[in-house]
């Protein structure tokens, strides 16, 4: 059962796993949710009736019955982990805590103009978990405007104390706001020879990598596969760190694989969920339950639905035994990983899928692409919206993309002559324009934010944000697309699609059904050759076939150029301009979204 509300002046008795320090009960709940075993917690707020050394303690608890006896205690706030809930969960914490000093290892001290600058510095520093900033009102003159970057073994403070005129906060890496590069490759036959901070058992290098990403201190990892010569180290996942943040050296070793934490690009691929099945593999751990199940898929469902289950092993039924049902062993451990992995015993193993909801919304798997044909199907491009104007009559004006629950990204040139946001309507989850009737629900537009350097599409800065009057509830047919990460500037996208209801040729009309076309990206040098009269800047990106024939056209403006990379769709471009439509050697020109990520974040996060 999902219980989201916090219980004031209430303490859960017993079941203690560990104690951490958090600046609020709300964040204590998040820490509990991400902890492999925590189901309940008790947080102690600051209070004159409490011993100050107990302020801000967050006691993580577990219980076989999923609940514990409640005791009245002033200043105690208790609650349940979100593991029991089905809604989206995020470790992202943008809160700034006034007059709190979050203690940790102070490894970097520098002057910053503001707490926001200090937080950005923390977010862009590979080691930083949280920071404390001394404001300009801080009593000690030499400490004013000092930004202290901190880290700890757990990623949470070792203690929190009251301190006037300072503010503290967390790194925003888990909010996908880091500018650190992210290295997604896994390097075969490679051992990274740096400090091990922890080790766990994992069935493959991908799971090892996801565990590393989830671990506060892990920057890179080495995994020894099941063919590794030393038996005691098989399936061992070594979580590593170094002072520079990168491996100091690498050693070539057969049957070892190494890679990097994806903490800086957490939004770009799902990281918490291990959805594969491992055949002829047994996961050992503390047994929670043994249940009969028809298949390994059914066993995984049982594990996912049992809140304490972390992983499972399914042993298929022997012929004509137990109505064809096998045994499903539901298991757990102190760290969420098997204590040992054995091969060759015939079991099928896997992990709970309850961690999937901790992925970012934009990474959620969408319907597979329909190969061939130009008409889309429902749910194929769930971030695509149709922007209508109601003046003088209602019509499709431009495309746009959902990038947040209150934000649409589109092109600035769409708003030529649009005097007020009141005449705009955003329709999401639409396949056919004919679906839009008088009573079709839409999102009103609260604000149009056009880039202040925009003059005309051809000169760049053709980008605009629409702030919606109400929030979008994400469903299969309406959900956001990931923004490209600034650390991914070197990515070469090979699977890019332009979508929209625009014209199919220059003299045409708006299409009823959402159209799609797969279009290759063109280098800016090549694009510049095709548009000698224009300046193709690095803030633009071009796409099109040399022979023409497929392109965006009138009415597609503002819509997405969506590129799939590592199974995740990224909003690489915004349809902007071009010479004619689908003309030979005249690629379409798109706003290069990665160059505007800072601008987007600045505008969408403004209070």
């Amino acid at each position: 059962e999902c219980v989201t509300q916090l219980l004031k002046d209430t303490c859960f008795e017993g079941g203690d796993i560990t104690t951490v320090f958090t600046p609020s009960a709300k964040y204590c709940q998040v820490v509990c949710t991400y902890h492999p075993r925590c189901l309940l917690f008790t947080f102690t707020a600051e209070s004159p009736s409490e011993d100050p050394t107990r302020w801000f303690t967050c006691v993580l608890k577990d219980s076989v019955t999923e609940t514990l006896p409640r005791v009245n205690r002033t200043a105690a706030i208790s609650g349940y982990s979100f593991k029991q809930c089905s809604h989206q969960i995020s470790a992202c914490n943008k809160d700034i805590y006034v007059d709190l000093d979050m203690k940790g290892i102070n490894y970097n001290s520098s002057v910053a103009k503001s707490a926001q600058e200090c937080q950005e510095r923390c977010t862009d520093d590979v080691h930083c978990h949280f920071f404390t900033y001394a404001t300009r009102q801080f009593p000690s003159l030499e400490h004013r405007n000092i930004c202290l970057l901190k880290h700890t073994q757990t990623g949470t403070p070792t203690r929190i104390t009251k301190l006037d005129k300072v503010v503290s906060g967390f790194s925003l890496k888990s909010c996908a706001l880091s500018n650190l590069a992210c290295i997604r490759d896994i390097f075969p036959n490679t051992v990274f020879a740096d400090s091990n901070i922890d080790s766990v058992m994992a069935p493959d290098a991908f799971v090892c990598g996801r565990i590393c990403t989830h671990h506060p201190g892990c920057l890179f990892f080495t995994f020894f596969s099941q063919e590794w010569p030393k038996e005691s180290q098989r399936n061992l996942c070594l979580l590593k760190t170094s002072e520079s943040g990168l491996p100091s050296t690498r050693i070539k070793k057969s049957k070892a694989l190494s890679g990097f934490s994806l903490q800086s690009c957490r939004h770009s691929i799902p990281v918490f969920c291990h959805s594969s099945f491992y055949h002829d593999t047994d996961f050992l751990g503390e047994e929670l339950d043994i249940v009969a199940a028809k298949s390994h898929e059914a066993c995984q469902k049982l594990c996912t639905n049992a809140v304490r289950c972390q992983f499972f092993t399914y042993t298929p039924a022997q012929a004509s035994c137990n109505e064809g049902k096998g045994k499903c062993y539901l298991k757990l451990s102190s760290n969420g990983s098997p204590t040992k992995i054995l091969h060759g015993r015939g079991g099928i193993s896997g992990y709970t899928l309850r961690l999937c909801k901790m992925d970012n919304e934009c990474t959620t798997k969408i319907k597979p692409r329909i190969v061939g044909g130009t008409a889309s199907v429902r749910g194929e491009w769930p971030w695509q919206v149709t922007l209508h104007t109601t003046s003088p009559t209602q019509r499709h004006l431009c495309g746009g993309s959902i990038i947040g629950n209150q934000w649409i990204l589109t092109a600035a040139h769409c708003f030529y002559g649009v005097e007020s946001p009141k005449i705009l309507r955003v329709y999401s989850g639409i396949l056919n324009q004919s679906e839009i009737k008088e009573d079709t629900s839409f999102f009103g537009v609260q604000e149009i934010i056009i880039h202040d350097q925009y003059k005309m599409a051809e000169s760049g800065y053709d980008i605009a944000l629409l702030k919606l009057e109400t929030t979008v509830n994400y469903t299969d047919s309406q959900r956001p697309i990931c923004l490209p990460s600034k650390g991914d500037r070197n990515v070469i996208y090979t699977d890019c699609w332009v979508t929209g209801w625009g014209y199919r040729k220059l003299r045409d009309k708006i299409q009823n059904t959402l159209q799609k076309a797969k279009i290759p990206l063109v280098t800016n040098e090549e694009c510049q050759k095709r548009y000698r009269g224009h300046k193709i800047t690095h803030k633009m990106i071009c796409a099109g076939y040399r022979e023409g024939g497929k392109d965006a056209c009138k009415g597609d403006s503002g819509g997405p150029l969506s590129c799939k990379h590592n199974e995740v769709w990224h909003l690489v471009g915004i349809t902007s301009w071009g010479e004619g439509c689908a003309q030979r050697e005249r690629p379409g020109v798109y706003t290069n979204v990665v160059e505007y990520v800072d601008w987007i974040l600045e505008k969408t996060q403004a209070v």
Epitope: A181, I183, R184, D185, P188, L246, I251, K252, N490, I492
Partner: antibody
Framework: QVQLQESGPGLVKPSQTLSLTCTVS??????????WSWIRQHPGKGLEWIGS???????YYNPSLKSRVTISVDTSKNQFSLKLSSVTAADTAVYYC?????????????????WGQGTTVTVSS | DIQMTQSPSSVSASVGDRVTITCRAS??????LAWYQQKPGKAPKLLIY???SLQSGVPSRFSGSGSGTDFTLTISSLQPEDFATYYC?????????FGGGTKVEIK
């Protein structure tokens, strides 16, 4: 097939920074299967590895040169570059760029299989 | 750093001779060793990788063997185009290091 071409000034003054670029043609630098390396050879001497870079930006340097070396990659231009600061006459050498195969397609194929023709750099005032 | 010691530093041989060059690593490198051929004024050319695997396009008269610390490059029947300098290289651990080279000269 893949070809590498070094470019940069042949003469550098002492204490200045040596800058070389290697352009990759006939294939993409954007591949997890390769590191892109710089090697130098002093006149009449053996080969000395300077460092390597992966398209992702991951770099490894020779510790003897680490404080002075920067290797970078530009996937959009299909190039990688070498910068060696505070040069002296001891840095006079032929500089090669090379492709270092790192487990191409899982067949454990390794080694520097493609080299540039080399560019002679003289450090002199 | 791993030191790679090649011997001999030079060898004089005739066409048709069998030539053996050895390379010793200062510590075990499994089979992470390559052999290169370099002719004057030219870039090195990869002959052997993973101690014994022949690079495609390289004549079969070249072979490599060894594992751990001791490695050998053998040219079974020396041809006129084989007169060059040969280098071994370890890539077991960074920094990558080369041997000092063995010059194969005409007798």
């Amino acid at each position: 097939q893949v070809q590498l071409q070094e470019s940069g000034p042949g003469l550098v003054k002492p204490s200045q920074t040596l800058s070389l670029t290697c352009t990759v043609s006939g294939g993409s630098i954007y591949s997890g299967a390769y590191y892109w390396s710089w090697i130098r050879q002093h006149p009449g001497k053996g080969l000395e590895w300077i460092g390597s870079i992966h398209y992702s930006g991951l770099t490894y340097y020779n510790p003897s040169l680490k404080s002075r070396v920067t290797i970078s990659v530009d996937t959009s231009k299909n190039q990688f570059s070498l910068k060696l600061s505070s040069v002296t006459a001891a840095d006079t050498a032929v500089y090669y760029c090379a492709r270092d195969v790192d487990d191409s397609s899982g067949d454990e194929h390794y080694g520097m299989d493609v080299w540039g023709q080399g560019t002679t750099v003289t450090v002199s005032s | 750093d791993i030191q790679m010691t090649q011997s001999p530093s030079s060898v004089s041989a005739s066409v048709g001779d069998r030539v053996t060059i050895t390379c010793r690593a200062s510590q075990g490198i499994d089979s992470w060793l390559a052999w290169y051929q370099q002719k004057p004024g030219k870039a090195p050319k990869l002959l052997i990788y993973a101690a014994s695997s022949l690079q495609s396009g390289v004549p079969s008269r070249f072979s490599g063997s060894g594992s751990g610390t001791d490695f050998t490059l053998t040219i079974s029947s020396l041809q006129p185009e084989d007169f060059a300098t040969y280098y071994c290289q370890q890539y077991h651990i960074v920094p990558i290091t080369f041997g000092g080279g063995t010059k194969v000269e005409i007798k």
